[in-house]
């Protein structure tokens, strides 16, 4: 190999050992029979050398540094050449470095021809191995602007006071052009400006200077985004840290075309703007940091550019001004992540503040719109609290548990609407009365409606789930001792059509001791399946539940248990079941940890089933499933 560097070229070539490998045989640079491991060639020098091994690329790397001085004379602006040409260099991993020094008042602009650049974060690498490392200077301090790969959106980077650009090419890469040019500009009065150009839909992830280390103190950095007018851009912060400011405030500023409030100033912790049409700028402004404990300012963010959807021009009014203690959240429904680009799906408040989820609270009227290619990617969860603090005022008071029509008219599917029902302890209980009798969801008879009511205790220490209930059954009412949550959960988009079937009234009633009482009025010819609360985990310790089962005068009810023994083993206390005829008060008592469960029994009159649990030994929980079937009395039951 022969490398000859022209005089005054300000180029230095350095061949040195790369990352040590575990190769058995060492390799040397051979110059007139001398074996060396490092070779430096300066401007005006010509050197002939060879390598002592077959694969020098496994041992050595080459650095070609060109110093460009714009302080003492005119700068060589224009397209930057790879000098010496890659064809003259040995096939080693090579790094071309251009170090440009300029006055503080001069702006320097790196322009990248297609393919543009894509910034990568710490620990990431470029698929083709070609990386661009760009740094700037503040006085004597080097500032890393970032590391970039090909195939991105970054088209220009403007700096002042100097720039250092390192292009790393793997030994096997055929590239023979730098891919960028340098131009001079007037002072940019900030650390740097990065221009990012979107031709169509896509995303870009960008980082503050020195990321993941701290952004230089009291500096300003700007990103300029070029977005076709027919597309919409949204910004989301992926990661940020704030330093400890002594003076001024760290912030981001947006210059958004058409905005009457430019620049729009946001804190880093704020929701960032979305649904922006056309070009916009984003600037990061640091502060004067506390000398004792500076902390670090850093920011990693994403810009997502996509087509506006039909929905994005539609404004929906969600009027929660007459609601109390209610919150509505629109959020992405959980999905498996796909590798390909997925357009963002945002919900926007007042068309500008867009984010992947949004929570609206009661007491106001909200205007929302959507920036989303497919609204089925979002769903809604609502929580409302109905509480009674004064038992004298609440007793016998009723509330309708209905999803407000404003919410049903939104183009997003309702997932859960939860009512938290709170009562004063040991003073009042609750009764739920459905508009249509309910069926309890069981494996034997699952609910197949578009929605169900999930009823569970709302007492933090109590793990008690009464069950899932849907319209079209035999449960006329559910009484519960204390605080509960009732969640209307939808299972199909057809809920919109079936919404009229929803309707539950809750009333505050005098306190009673049992955890729950189900009033069941079976319909003729249908088998009613009932099961104890907390089916999968077992009825909680010392909990008692009852079923009040009505038997019409001309019918007889068959009560059937689905296993021979309850399976419960009591550690302390008693587990028992009482089956009591309501007319005669005659009762049968069964010890659930001693007795076999009763064989199918026939009841000519309304009756109670009461199940009370002990404190079971672990793994020996109380779970009972039973059914009630009505048949006409005329049938001979013998």
């Amino acid at each position: 190999f022969e490398i000859a560097l022209p005089r005054e070229s300000n180029i230095t070539v350095l061949i040195k050992l790369g990352t040590p490998t575990l190769l058995a045989k060492p390799c040397y640079i051979v110059i007139s029979k001398r074996h060396i491991t490092m070779l430096s060639i300066k401007s005006g020098e010509r050197i002939v050398f060879t390598f002592s091994c077959q694969s020098p690329e496994n041992h050595f790397v080459i650095e070609i540094q060109k110093n460009i001085d714009c302080m003492s004379g005119p700068c060589p602006f224009g397209e930057v050449q790879l000098q010496p040409s890659t064809s003259l260099l040995p096939t080693l991993n090579r790094t071309f470095i251009w170090d440009v020094k300029a006055h503080k008042s001069i702006g320097l602009e790196l322009q990248f021809s297609i393919p543009r650049l894509r910034q990568i974060g710490p620990g990431e690498s470029c698929p083709d191995g070609v990386t661009h490392s760009i740094s700037g200077r503040i006085d004597a301090t080097v500032v890393r602007i970032g590391t970039f790969c090909s195939n991105g959106t970054v088209s220009r980077i403007k700096m002042q006071e100097g720039v250092k650009m390192a292009l790393h090419l793997p030994w096997f890469h055929p590239r023979n052009v730098s891919g960028f040019s340098i131009a001079n500009r007037s002072s940019i009065k900030r650390l740097c400006i990065i221009e990012s150009v979107f031709e169509g839909e896509g995303s870009a992830t960008l980082m503050s200077a020195n990321y993941p280390e701290g952004f230089p103190e009291d500096e300003l950095m700007t990103w300029q985004f070029v977005v076709p007018a027919h597309l919409r851009a949204s910004v989301s912060f992926l990661n940020f840290n704030l330093s400890n400011c002594e003076r001024k405030e760290e912030r981001v500023e947006y210059y958004i075309p058409g905005s009457t409030t430019n620049p729009e100033v946001f804190k880093l912790e704020d929701k960032q703007p979305g649904n922006m049409a056309g070009n916009f700028n984003l600037s990061l402004q640091g502060c004067d940091q506390d000398a004792q404990s500076p902390g670090i300012l850093r920011l990693q963010f994403q810009v997502l550019v996509q087509h506006p959807q039909n929905e994005s021009n539609k404004i929906y009014v969600v009027d929660l001004s007459n609601e109390r203690a209610m919150s509505l959240t629109i959020e992405p429904r959980p999905v498996k992540q796909s590798r390909k680009f997925v357009p963002g799906c945002f919900v926007c408040l007042e068309s500008r503040t867009c984010s992947s989820n949004l929570t609206l609270t009661s007491g106001s009227k909200h205007k929302i719109s959507f920036l989303c290619d497919d609204l089925t990617r979002l769903w809604m969860n609502v929580e409302k609290t109905i509480s009674c603090t004064d038992h004298r005022y609440c007793q016998r008071k009723s509330y309708s548990l209905q999803v407000p029509s404003d919410i049903l008219h939104l183009p997003v599917e309702l997932h859960d609407f939860s009512w938290k029902l709170l009562v004063p302890k040991d003073r009042l209980s609750l009764v739920l009365v459905p508009a249509q009798k309910l069926q309890q969801h069981t494996h034997e008879k699952p609910c197949n409606t578009s929605f169900s009511y999930l009823v569970a205790s709302a007492i933090p220490s109590q793990d008690l789930y009464f069950g899932s209930f849907c319209p079209g059954g035999s449960i006329k009412q559910i009484q519960v001792k204390q605080n509960i949550s009732v969640t209307l959960r939808t299972f199909a988009p057809s809920f919109q059509q079936e919404a009229s079937r929803q309707g539950l009234t809750v009333s505050f009633i005098p306190y009673f001791k049992e955890e729950g009482v189900f009033t069941v009025t079976p319909d003729t010819k249908s088998k009613v399946y009932l099961r104890t609360p907390n089916w999968d985990r077992g009825l909680p310790s010392l909990t008692s539940v009852s079923w009040n089962i009505s038997v019409p005068r001309d019918q007889v009810a068959c009560l059937t248990f689905f296993k021979e023994r309850s399976g419960v083993v009591c550690q302390t206390g008693r587990a028992f079941m009482i089956i009591q005829e309501q007319r005669t008060r005659a009762e049968e008592i069964f010890s659930l940890d001693e007795d076999v469960l009763p064989k199918p029994s026939f009841h000519h009159h309304s009756f109670w089933v009461n199940i009370s649990n002990c404190s079971p030994t672990s793994g020996k929980q109380l779970d009972l499933l039973f059914s009630v079937t009505l048949t006409p009395r005329t049938v001979d039951l013998t």
């Epitope: 302390t572 206390g573 008693r574 028992f576 049968e588 008592i589 010890s591 001693e594 007795d595 009370s612």
Partner: antibody
Framework: QVQLQESGPGLVKPSETLSLTCAVS?????????WGWIRQPPGKGLEWIGS???????YYNPSLKSRVTISVDTSKNQFSLKLSSVTAADTAVYYC????????????WGQGTMVTVSS | DIQLTQSPSFLSASVGDRVTITCRAS??????LAWYQQKPGKAPKLLIY???TLQSGVPSRFSGSGSGTEFTLTISSLQPEDFATYYC?????????FGQGTKLEIK
């Protein structure tokens, strides 16, 4: 009306076995109840001896377990207590009582029978 | 075994007085506690079960409260027939145990 009546010898010699029976009237012994024995030495407090469920499951006071046997005879609607190797310390009024599962208390008691252990 | 400690062991009071007897369990027994009244030469009589439920036929001047380890029996206005010995009993776990008794005497 449910009644319980203890019967058995009032005097037992040391080292012998004390045997008492409790006859239940006005209620079937085989329906959701535990049946227990409790004793009370003269001038002292109450001590639970053991209980039996109608199915035959028994529960004994560990302090007496090695000497006590409780059994049930549903056909005669009665249950029995046997306490072996008695000593003077076993002298007491012996009560039989009904323990309703749903109540978890001895709600009905026999009037008691005094048993003296003496040679 | 669960120990039950009654206090006081002896109590002198007059007709019409309000009296309270305490029963303390050595470990939690939920509400599995019963109170009995015993008169000389007679079998004990159930007054209260499940810590606070009045047995049918028992005058309403008797009341029970508590759960866990601390329980009380209260007689709101003593009647002449209430002078007797009172026992608490736990039926939470075997072996069932009784308190040592509280003798209520006429002052």
């Amino acid at each position: 009306q449910v009644q319980l009546q203890e019967s058995g010898p009032g005097l037992v010699k040391p080292s012998e076995t004390l045997s008492l029976t409790c006859a239940v009237s006005g209620y079937s012994i085989s329906s959701g109840y535990y049946w227990g024995w409790i004793r009370q030495p003269p001038g002292k407090g109450l001590e639970w001896i053991g209980s039996i469920y109608h199915s035959g499951s028994t529960y004994y006071n560990p302090s007496l377990k090695s000497r006590v046997t409780i059994s049930v005879d549903t056909s005669k609607n009665q249950f029995s207590l046997k306490l072996s190797s008695v000593t003077a310390a076993d002298t007491a009024v012996y009560y039989c009582a009904r323990d309703k599962i749903t109540v978890a208390a001895f709600d009905i008691w026999g009037q008691g029978t005094m048993v003296t252990v003496s040679s | 075994d669960i120990q039950l400690t009654q206090s006081p062991s002896f109590l002198s009071a007059s007709v019409g007085d309000r009296v309270t007897i305490t029963c303390r369990a050595s470990q939690g027994i939920s509400s599995y506690l019963a109170w009995y009244q015993q008169k000389p030469g007679k079998a004990p009589k159930l007054l209260i079960y499940a810590a606070s439920t009045l047995q049918s036929g028992v005058p309403s001047r008797f009341s029970g409260s508590g759960s866990g380890t601390e329980f009380t029996l209260t007689i709101s206005s003593l009647q002449p027939e209430d002078f007797a010995t009172y026992y608490c009993q736990q039926l939470n776990s075997y072996p069932y145990t009784f308190g040592q008794g509280t003798k209520l005497e006429i002052k």
